[in-house]
Interface confidence: low
Amino acid sequence: QVTDINSKGLELRKTVTTVETQNLEDLHHDGQFCHKPCPPGERKARDCTVNGDEPDCVPCQEGKEYTDKAHFSSKCRRCRLCDEGHGLEVEINCTRTQNTKCRCKPNFFCNSTVCEHCDPCTKCEHGIIKECTLASNTKCKEEGSRSNLWWLCLLLLPIPLIVWVKRKEVQKTCRKHRKENQGSHESPTLNPETVAINLSDVDLSKYITTIAGVMTLSQVKGFVRKNGVNEAKIDEIKNDNVQDTAEQKVQLLRNWHQLHGKKDAYDTLIKGLKKANLCTLAEKIQTIILKDITSDSENSNFRNEIQSLV
């Protein structure tokens, strides 16, 4: 197939062809291909035509939509909203070619690289060691440091016990669940509800990459679909990371977490997986998080407290 410009100077902006190569499935747009994508800040006005000699891209709505790279979509992306409820405010306004940049509001901080919510800075009763910054919480002076250490020991002692008890409960329930469903004797899985009760306030944002790693793309899509992420957003994330399914999973889960908020996110995840009969998967995630929390609590936190108090 040859496409040239005739003597009248007709601009051939697009060459329409159809997919013949199987491995290009993910890059397929509306069953057709445009030779030229729309530049940043614009979107496709309509589907590709063989010799579309009119302008084929139109600008995104300033302040409401953007596209930050060349693309073939007929939709611009919606500008990010900096949710005050999550402790965020606008750092840089959305333009046609750049998404909004958010930052923590004054007296809020965020210690993860991608900030989906900021936490309020701790107010110190007995004076400040280190001021709160955008990236770290206030460090407070403590009254009666030594006695606090004993309180800490008492608080931490039951953790391994609780975890052990919970694991036993979980294993029982999941064995029962498996026997009922399959009549088989597989390795124990969890009853997510039992665990969720204990860990409902865990901050999932730091585990999203790990969780994405143990879930398949279809499992992630199924979960986020049922939990408030719309199709447009799912498609957008897919198109942004066409050849990187790992990144698709991370972004889908991040998006769900951002929508859902920190509170009860763990609960929702575990219950959602249980509903979808993904008991083993739920156990994997629970084990990862429990391991991390217990080793954090028992080791690093305990050591750090001893060093700073003794």
Partner: antibody, heavy 122, light 107 residues
Framework: QVQLQQWGAGLLKPSETLSLICAVY????????WTWIRQPPGKGLEWIGE???????NYSPSLKSRVTISVDTSKNHISLNLTSVTAADTALYYC????????????????WGQGTTVTVSS | DIQMTQSPSSLSASVGDRVTITCRAS??????LAWYQQKPEKAPKSLIY???SLQSGVPSRFSGSGSGTDFTLTISSLQPEDFATYYC?????????FGQGTKLEIK
Amino acid sequence: QVQLQQWGAGLLKPSETLSLICAVYGGSFSTYYWTWIRQPPGKGLEWIGEINHRGTTNYSPSLKSRVTISVDTSKNHISLNLTSVTAADTALYYCARGLLWIGEGDYGLDVWGQGTTVTVSS
Amino acid sequence: DIQMTQSPSSLSASVGDRVTITCRASQGIRRWLAWYQQKPEKAPKSLIYAASSLQSGVPSRFSGSGSGTDFTLTISSLQPEDFATYYCQQYNSYPYTFGQGTKLEIK
């Protein structure tokens, strides 16, 4: 890392046919347009034309009657043929990776071959 | 064909200077413009695509701006390795065309 390796006859007589080959190593071959550009001695760059892996071509009108760009997908080769050459075709010929055929993105001519000097002289 | 006109054709500058090269299209090309750097006996190297997007691995002292018919390439603080010839190229409509080049020399 994508690399473009070029070769072909460097010295031609007027009226002969210029033939150059550009081999693509590494990276995706089937999602890009592959472009030929030339640069006469001491002058600027001139776009000759482009092709994708399906053989879809776009040519410069000034060379269209003499130029053929073809593709061999089994070898990831792109070739340039220019018939009836004259001294005006003496130039350094480059192949380059062009606009994405499909998928998101646009990077201009982001990867270039080393260039092949072609001299037309009687 | 769309004519691309670069100015100036040549300029002399010193290390540390801020330099701006302009490129004008004879008709609107939206943001479909690329900038290339070419050193003697070397193939051109892509610096900027889509008028203002920095090519991967290119130092941030290079920046591009403009849309429609008027475009600029700016080097915020010239380094010794930046002395070369710079070309703009439109790829909005066929045939894709290049500017005549701007030779940047040491003062």
